[in-house]
Interface confidence: medium
Amino acid sequence: FERTRSLQDPCSNCPAGTFCDNNRNQICSPCPPNSFSSAGGQRTCDICRQCKGVFRTRKECSSTSNAECDCTPGFHCLGAGCSMCEQDCKQGQELTKKGCKDCCFGTFNDQKRGICRPWTNCSLDGKSVLVNGTKERDVVCGPSPADLSPGASSVTPPAPAREPGHSPQ
């Protein structure tokens, strides 16, 4: 057991937050300011991420963990670990290389990010349009035209389609 220990890499004893300093007889030295080591046995410490520009600090760097960034208001994170920030747009718009642009007729976007998507084609499911679409909202599909013909049993429209204070006709 003793022999095994002596053959071990002495650096393996260095905990997170330190590095194995070759210049000092492989002593475990604390990570310098603005650097960290998240695992033991490391021969160098990594430079802390700096959150600047549109990035803002969500979690400060410590000797054992990197800083974490998010995006300033008006932007949202993209990529692993918020590696990029992308500009928000208003609902009813999409981000293009020319900035935020309104959704074309027949498309909508109900979020501040992403692209405009086509309205649902109700007729593909044999249904009719109950509520028209807008730039911000998809159409609401209702019962099929056949269900609304005279003599057919009455169908209650889905709850979200009703306007507040109005009962179904």
Epitope: G53, V54, L78, G79, M84, E86, Q87, L95, T96, K97
Partner: nanobody
């Protein structure tokens, strides 16, 4: 180290001109779209202009169209913003950022930012 450093800001009278520069280092500048943003006092960041890798595509926010010109010199790893007919409402900290297109069909993310340069338009 990947870095962007802006310069060229200053105090200018309304109607005057300034040319901002953004020096890039630590990455292959010619492979990236580049973008200018600005932040007026007490306001959020506003996209100003962007330019594609070879300078053949340029886009501007409506409020600066015809007054500002974005350009780049890939041999010098530099991005520029020529600002003419400046107005008081152009007063802001101006940032350059790496990116603006090329992260997927609908992604326009910026991953590297400079520290900003201040432009003040006042008489």
């Amino acid at each position: 180290e990947v870095q962007l450093v802006e310069s060229g800001g200053g105090l200018v009278q309304p109607g005057g001109s300034l040319r901002l520069s953004c020096a890039a280092s630590g990455f292959t500048f010619s492979s990236y779209w580049m973008t200018w943003f600005r932040q007026a006092p007490g306001r959020g960041l506003e996209w100003v202009a962007n330019i594609n890798q070879d300078g053949s595509e340029k886009y501007y926010v409506d409020s600066v169209e015809g007054r500002f010109t974005v350009s780049r010199d890939n041999a010098k790893n530099s991005l520029y913003l020529q600002m003419n007919s400046l107005r008081a409402e152009d007063t802001a900290v101006y940032y350059c950022a790496r990116g603006g297109l090329g992260y997927g069909d609908s992604h326009y993310g910026m991953d590297v930012w400079g520290q900003g340069t201040t432009v003040t338009v006042s008489s």
